[in-house]
Amino acid sequence: VLPRWRQQWSGSGTTSRFPETVLARCVKYTEVHPEMRHVDCQSVWDAFKGAFISKYPCNITEEDYQPLVKLGTQTVPCNKTLLWSRIKDLAHQFTQVQRDMFTLEDMLLGYLADDLTWCGEFNTFEINYQSCPDWRKDCSNNPVSVFWKTVSRRFAETACGVVHVMLNGSRSKIFDKNSTFGSVEVHNLQPEKVQALEAWVIHGGREDSRDLCQDPTIKELESIISKRNIRFFCKNIYRPDKFLQCVKNPEDSSCLSGI
C-alpha cells in the first residue's frame, strides 16, 4: 500500500509525544495548583485536540481555541501580571522566584503549550509529526500561532491594576509592534481595569549605563499606551543578574543601591 500523500510544510513537525506531553503537563499543573484541581485533564486534551485535528492547518481561527480557553479559565490577582517580549527566560526566572507574579506560561494553558509545536491535517484524525506551517514561509493562521494569539489576548484582557512588562534592551527594537506583546497584548489591556503599564527594560552589557527608557521604540510604546488612557512607567534594569539576586534576597545590603 502506498503511503497517503501528506502536505509538506516549511516548519518542524509536531513535537514528539505531543498528546502525552500535554496530558502529563496538565496533570502536573493541576496537582501543584490547588485552585485548578477541579480541571479534568482529559477534557482539556479533548478540547485542545478539537482545535486543530481534521482542520486545514493554515485556516485555524481564534474561535477554534475558545473551548480550550473556556476549560482553562484562570484569574490573576490585580498587579500580578507580567508580560514579556523577546526575554522569556529572564521573565520565567523572575516568576519562579517572585511566586506571586505570573507570566502567561505560569498559567495552565501557557504551561501546556510552552515550547511545543503541533498541527494536524485536513479531514484526517492524524497529527502531523513530519512538518507544520511556518509563520513566515507558509501562513500565519497556523495552529501554534493562533493558539498564542488567542491565549495572549485573553491573558491581557483579564489583567488588572498595574501590569508589568519585561523588554529586551539588547535588541534593535526594544518594543516591537510586530511581537505578540506589541500586536496583541498592548491592544487588549482594558483601560477600565488597568491603571498603568510599567516597562522593565533589561540591559545586556555590564557597562551599559544608557537610559533605555528614552529609546524611540519605548516612546512609541508610551504613546500607544497613553492614547488608551493607561498610564505608562519605565525602569532600567541595568544588572539583570543582580536584579534576580535581589528578588531572591531583598535584605542584601547591595540591593539597597540601584539595579
Epitope: 477534557s43 474561535e63 475558545q66 473551548p67 473556556k70 476549560l71
Partner: antibody
C-alpha cells in the same frame, strides 16, 4: 434517528423545586457538551446552563447561578436540570440541546417541557 | 439585555431576498450560529460555524460574519420562512448568548 426528549415540567409554587430530565438517543451522548435553554412566554431564547461531555465542568447563566444544577448520567444517556428556589421569572419552556463540537452551534433540540412557577 | 443585538422585525415578499443582522463585540472571536423557530415549535439550527449549513437546510439560507457583525440572508423568500430567527455565539465569558430574535413576516 437523533433525538432529545425532555420531561419533568410542571406547575410549582415560588420557592419550590423541580427536576427536569432529557433523554438522548441516536448519537454518542458521552461525546458531546449539552445545554439547557429556556424561553419565557412571548420572549426570546435564553441560555441557562452547559455541561461538558464527561460532566466534569458546568457553567450557568447569572440568573440561575446557585439555584440550578446541571448534571448528566452518560451511562443512561440522560441530562438533568435540578431547579431550586424557583421564582415567577423562571416560568418558561425549557429545551435541552446538543452542542456541535463545543461552540459550532446547537444542532439537536428537544421539543421542550413547560415549567410554570405560580402561587 | 442580550449582548447580541438583532432588529425585532423584518419583512419581505415571496421571492425576495431578506437579510437579518446580528451585532455584538463577542462575535469577533467566537463562532456564530443561526436558528429558525417556527410558531409553536422548538428552534432548529440553520447555520453553524459562522456560515456553514447543516445537511437538509436549503441553500437559500446563507450567512456571513465580519468583525463584530454577522448576518443571515434568505433568498427566494417563501411563506414557510415566516418564523423567528435567532443568532447565537459565545460571550466574553465564553458562555452561550442569544440575540433577542427577529420576527420575519412574509407579506
Amino acid at each position: 434517528e437523533v433525538q432529545l426528549l425532555e420531561s419533568g415540567g410542571d406547575l410549582v409554587q415560588p420557592g419550590g423545586s423541580l427536576r427536569l430530565s432529557c433523554g438522548a438517543s441516536g448519537f454518542t451522548f458521552s461525546d458531546h457538551y449539552m445545554s439547557w435553554v429556556r424561553q419565557a412566554p412571548g420572549k426570546g431564547l435564553e441560555w441557562v446552563a452547559d455541561i461538558s461531555a464527561r460532566g466534569s465542568n458546568t457553567w450557568y447563566a447569572d440568573s440561575v447561578k446557585g439555584r440550578f444544577t446541571i448534571s448528566r448520567d452518560n451511562s443512561e444517556n440522560t441530562l438533568y436540570l435540578q431547579m431550586n428556589s424557583l421564582r415567577a421569572e423562571d416560568t418558561a419552556v425549557y429545551y435541552c440541546a446538543k452542542n456541535w463540537n463545543y461552540n459550532y452551534g446547537m444542532d439537536v433540540w428537544g421539543q421542550g417541557t413547560t415549567v410554570t412557577v405560580s402561587s | 439585555q442580550s449582548v447580541l443585538t438583532q432588529a425585532p422585525s423584518a419583512s419581505g415578499t415571496p421571492g425576495q431576498r431578506v437579510t437579518i443582522s446580528c451585532s455584538g463585540s463577542s462575535i469577533q472571536n467566537n463562532y456564530v450560529s443561526w436558528y429558525q423557530q417556527l410558531p409553536g415549535t422548538a428552534p432548529k439550527l440553520l447555520i453553524y460555524r459562522n456560515f456553514e449549513r447543516p445537511s437538509g437546510v436549503p441553500d437559500r439560507f446563507s450567512a456571513s460574519k465580519s468583525g463584530t457583525s454577522a448576518s443571515l440572508a434568505i433568498s427566494g423568500l417563501q411563506s414557510e420562512d415566516e418564523a423567528d430567527y435567532y443568532c447565537a455565539s459565545w460571550d466574553d465569558s465564553l458562555n452561550w448568548v442569544f440575540g433577542g430574535g427577529t420576527k420575519l413576516t412574509v407579506l
